[in-house]
Interface confidence: low
């Protein structure tokens, strides 16, 4: 039975040209995290594998940095980076937990962090 929950940074915004940390945290489970995938709807950004470490997709290696922790740092943001991001926790024996973050990249300097929310 899957008892865990994923807490994410929720809806966030950042300035064009700046950077942002995408962060998820899995709690309320003793399951072992074997791998965390960071994805957009149609592409893989990065993988943190418990055995193999970090792998950044070749098309993002200049703009994505691993960490902090299991999080992901996006750099040199453009308006095209606006959209949904997903952290997918592969765990044993529970299975897969998924968290969603919506990032809005703003032209101006009115970027503010949104509220945290949880996805069971």
């Amino acid at each position: 039975m899957m008892t865990g929950t994923i807490e994410t940074t929720g809806n966030i915004s950042a300035e064009k040209g700046g950077s942002i940390i995408l962060q998820c945290h899995l709690s309320s489970t003793t399951a072992q995290v074997t791998q965390v995938n960071w994805e957009q709807q149609d592409q893989l950004l990065a993988i943190c594998n418990a055995d193999l470490g970090w792998h950044i997709s070749p098309s993002f290696k200049d703009r994505v940095a691993p960490g902090p922790g299991l999080g992901l740092t996006l750099q040199s943001l453009t308006v095209n980076d606006t959209g949904e991001y997903f952290c997918i926790y592969h765990t044993y024996p529970d299975g897969t937990y998924t968290g969603r973050i919506f990032l809005e990249v703003l032209e101006s300097s009115v970027a503010e962090h949104g509220a945290r929310f949880q996805i069971p």
């Epitope: 074997t34 791998q35 709807q41 149609d42 993988i47 193999l52 792998h55 997903f86 997918i88 592969h90």
Partner: antibody, heavy 120, light 107 residues
Framework: QVQLQESGAELARPGASVKLSCKAS????????ISWVKQRTGQGLEWIGE????????YYNEKFKGKATLTADKSSSTAYMELSSLTSEDSAVYFC?????????????WGQGTILTVSS | DIQMTQSPASLAASVGETVTITCRAS??????LAWYQQKQGKSPQLLIY???SLEDGVPSRFSGSGSGTQYSMKINSMQPEDTATYFC?????????FGGGTKLEIK
């Protein structure tokens, strides 16, 4: 329930073009990608490419670039694949399939297949 | 392109027997492996994704395992309705690539 209805069998002449269709129902068309897969008689499966209707992003197998063109019409929830400069090598069954949720990246629902016969 | 080498190409098993099919990737695919079942004249059906996650509605006698470049699918107790061709597929990189298939028949 999720359904993908593909167009009927096609008989085409060498050198001609055909446009196969795949009408989706039972889910939000723009929330998932559509893959196209080729299977020649008695053979294995070959990935042609995939399209994400929300963004229009397409990803192709290099082997099919210039041969297949993937499009999607959001208003009718229909995906299309046009095959050009047909030869006997293009005779096959063509499947469309829905790309499953972002955490699976695999085809979870398939159309019934369209048989394409290229003959003079 | 990532090459997927599947074995065996064919096998026959008795009802109740345990069957194992293997798939080897030419490079690390980070658990991004799926298994499909295709019955004669039908469309493929997703059985397992992320190497070991069972798709909804798939009987629990099917299971997947593996990591890195080596993966396998096991059918715990072969049933007549499991007669089909099975394909592995890597979803890690473009182009997605399938194994050559394993034709499974009843002995």
């Amino acid at each position: 329930q999720v359904q993908l209805q593909e167009s009927g069998a096609e008989l085409a002449r060498p050198g001609a073009s055909v446009k196969l269709s795949c009408k989706a129902s039972g889910y939000t068309f723009t929330s998932y990608g559509i893959s196209w897969v080729k299977q020649r008689t008695g053979q294995g499966l070959e990935w042609i490419g995939e399209i994400y209707p929300r963004s229009g992003n397409t990803y192709y197998n290099e082997k099919f670039k210039g041969k297949a063109t993937l499009t999607a019409d959001k208003s009718s929830s229909t995906a299309y694949m046009e095959l050009s400069s047909l030869t006997s090598e293009d005779s096959a069954v063509y499947f469309c399939a829905r790309k499953g949720p972002y955490y699976t990246k695999n085809e979870d629902y398939w159309g019934q297949g369209t048989i394409l016969t290229v003959s003079s | 392109d990532i090459q997927m080498t599947q074995s065996p190409a064919s096998l026959a098993a008795s009802v109740g027997e345990t069957v194992t099919i293997t798939c080897r990737a030419s490079e690390h695919i980070y658990y991004s492996l799926a298994w499909y079942q295709q019955k004669q004249g039908k469309s493929p059906q997703l059985l397992i994704y992320n190497a070991n996650s069972l798709e909804d509605g798939v009987p629990s006698r099917f299971s997947g395992s593996g990591s890195g470049t080596q993966y396998s699918m096991k059918i715990n107790s072969m049933q007549p309705e499991d007669t089909a061709t099975y394909f592995c597929k890597q979803a890690y990189d473009v182009p997605r690539t399938f194994g050559g298939g394993t034709k499974l028949e009843i002995k």
